[in-house]
Interface confidence: low
């Protein structure tokens, strides 16, 4: 099922973090928070559904303690006063690693999943509908927070003028040889003007179900792989692609492809055999020249989960990993709206795809 | 227009060895999973193996592992099955599909499934 | 590895019957699976992907629904050409080999 018409994405937002939930908190809404654990000394993080900015009445608190052996805590919080305790004494998180933590709202309870995993079901406490806000705190690092709504609703024309909700800025292109240390991209205001969000159905109308077996044995839904699908629109400036997934153990490359016709305008090839992340463009069936030249380490690791944030601007492509800029590729194919196709394939399981 | 293609097929004694082409067209078998699937003379389907050409990825049912091979040749956009060791029981029509996942009108439906399958070709171990 | 137990594994129906095929995975396969129908001398046909998604083509007599680890496919009226076996097949191969349903012979009551 694809989303449309959904809520912009919070785009790396500084942590402590709050944000509108516009419109609020409805059956089937699922919410995306991905980012990565810190590997400091801090021992808790925490996303919260909750009414208003205060912090006084909290809907779901979701709470993962880096404490004795580790565990989560979920909780609701009415005018100022906790409730009981539901602990589940598992933690899905580790520190200094990239997760993707997903919630569905259901009408009677949230579904967590944690790296394509259900973790936890929380049962309402308080009726759902009075969320409007989401916030995040704690000893984690944020690469984006998206929405996506399950009503299907005519897509928008491919120049609407939905805003980000907090814009994405990649850091100017290095003069000298070397480059400063990525760091999350700062505000900049170019509008989003769409999102279609492709999600993986366990039945119709919702996005998981109720498991028949425990929670933690449930499988992955993967996206069937590879995985194509149509980019609305094409590319043009301001577009924005997000990506999350898992790097199978054993994986040897994978590939993300952005095509136009029989071409692909751009090739991304992490290749674990080769240490190396190749950049290319294939015009009827010819490569041209690789661009492999990384700021950093090799940011993809076997067996761990990443997200890929590709932004088109006018002259090139800036893809992140992580929330970290990785580098820059500039256009071959020069005819924007015809990159109209992602393709994903290789040894990765995919989680999330919006476009 | 999708279509698959096999031969290969025939008669050939216990202990014997064969070779399924599967050959494609109208798409490409470098970015596709191609699947083997056998139905022995009045019975059910069986999967036997698929190759993920791309990442030269591939899996096989516990009743050919070590026996069989599958691969492509991507230059040729074909399929193949090489049948070593082949038993009695190996007597079936063996099918090649395609288990598609391309997206439909590019919102996020997909095929999970094969999709296309060719005519079958028929292998007979006998002595 | 994952098994496939569909039932009834044949049924004798009228055209303008309502039919009714289930298939119970013995795990979790989320919804993976897949409906084909063949008919004798033939290749399979897909009917239904993803559990409850119609292939293009396929008429809209057929469907197919999920309960947990229970699969349905219905046909609603039953049609001469709809007179075939019908198999089920879940495709969680990335750990798993795929595996087909024993298959269920609809057969002209």
């Known amino acids: 099922m694809a989303f449309s018409g959904s809520q912009a994405p919070y785009l790396s937002p500084a942590v402590p973090f709050s944000g509108t939930i516009q419109g609020g908190l409805q059956d089937g809404l699922q919410i995306t928070v991905n980012g990565t654990v810190l590997s400091s000394s801090g021992t808790r993080f925490a996303v919260n559904f909750q009414t208003g900015f205060s912090g006084n009445d909290i809907a779901f608190h979701f709470n993962p303690r880096f404490e004795d052996g580790g565990y989560v805590v979920c909780n609701t919080r009415q005018n100022g006063s906790w409730g009981p305790e539901e602990r589940k004494t598992h933690m899905p998180f580790q520190k200094g690693m990239p997760f993707d933590l997903c919630f569905l709202v259901q009408s009677s309870d949230f579904k967590v999943m944690v790296n394509g995993i259900l973790f936890v079901q929380y049962f309402h406490r308080v009726p759902f509908h009075r969320v409007d806000t989401i916030s995040v705190n704690g000893s984690v690092q944020l690469s984006y927070i998206s929405f996506q709504n399950p009503r299907t609703v005519p897509v928008q024309p491919a120049f609407s003028t939905v805003p980000f909700s907090q814009p994405v800025c990649f850091p100017p292109r290095p003069r000298g040889r070397r480059q400063k240390p990525p760091g999350v991209w700062p505000a900049n205001p170019a509008p989003i003007t769409q999102t279609v969000i492709h999600t993986v159905q366990s039945a119709p109308g919702q996005m998981f179900s109720t498991p028949a077996i425990p929670p933690m044995m449930y499988p992955h839904p993967a996206y069937p792989m590879p995985f194509i699908t149509t980019i609305l629109g094409g590319l043009y400036p301001s577009k924005s692609i997000l990506l999350s997934g898992t790097v199978l153990p054993s994986a040897q490359r994978f590939h993300i492809n952005l095509c136009s016709g029989n071409h692909i305008a751009f090739h991304l090839n992490p290749r674990f055999d080769e240490n190396a992340v190749v950049r290319n463009t294939q015009i009827d069936n010819s490569w041209g020249s690789e661009e492999r030249s990384l700021p950093r380490k090799m940011p993809f690791v076997r067996g761990q989960s990443f997200s890929v944030w590709i932004l088109c601007e006018a002259h090139c492509l800036k893809v992140a990993v992580d929330g970290q800029h990785l580098f820059e590729y500039y256009h071959r194919l020069r005819n924007l709206p015809t990159i109209n196709r992602l393709e994903v394939g290789g040894d990765i399981q995919l989680t999330h795809v919006q476009t | 227009e999708v279509q698959l293609v096999e031969s290969g097929g025939g008669l050939v004694q216990p202990g014997g060895s064969l070779r399924l082409s599967c050959a494609a067209s109208g798409f490409t078998v470098s970015s596709s999973s191609i699947h083997w699937v056998r139905q022995a003379p009045g019975k059910g389907l069986e999967w036997v193996a698929y190759i993920y050409p791309y990442s030269s990825s591939s899996s096989y049912a516990d009743s050919v592992k070590g026996r069989f091979t599958i691969s492509a040749d991507t230059s040729k956009n074909t399929a193949y099955l090489q049948m070593n060791s082949l038993r009695a029981e190996d007597t079936a029509v063996y099918y090649c599909?395609?288990?598609?996942?391309?997206?439909?009108?590019?919102?996020?439906?997909?095929?999970?499934?094969?999709?296309?399958w060719g005519q079958g070709t028929l292998v007979t171990v006998s002595s | 590895d994952i098994q496939m137990t569909q039932s009834p594994s044949s049924l004798s129906a009228s055209v303008g019957d309502r039919v009714t095929i289930t298939c119970r995975a013995s795990q979790s396969v989320s919804s993976a699976v897949a409906w084909y129908q063949q008919k004798p001398g033939k290749a399979p046909k897909l009917l239904i992907y993803s559990a409850s998604s119609l292939y293009s083509g396929v008429p809209s007599r057929f469907s197919g629904s999920r309960s947990g680890t229970d699969f349905t496919l219905t046909i609603s009226s039953l049609q001469p050409e709809d007179f075939a076996t019908y198999y089920c097949?879940?495709?969680?191969?990335?750990?798993?080999?795929?595996?087909f349903g024993q298959g269920t012979k609809v057969e002209i009551k």
């Open positions: 097949q879940q495709s969680y191969y990335d750990s798993n080999p795929i595996t």
């Open positions: 599909a395609r288990y598609s996942t391309y997206s439909w009108g590019g919102i996020g439906k997909w095929v999970w499934g094969m999709d296309y």
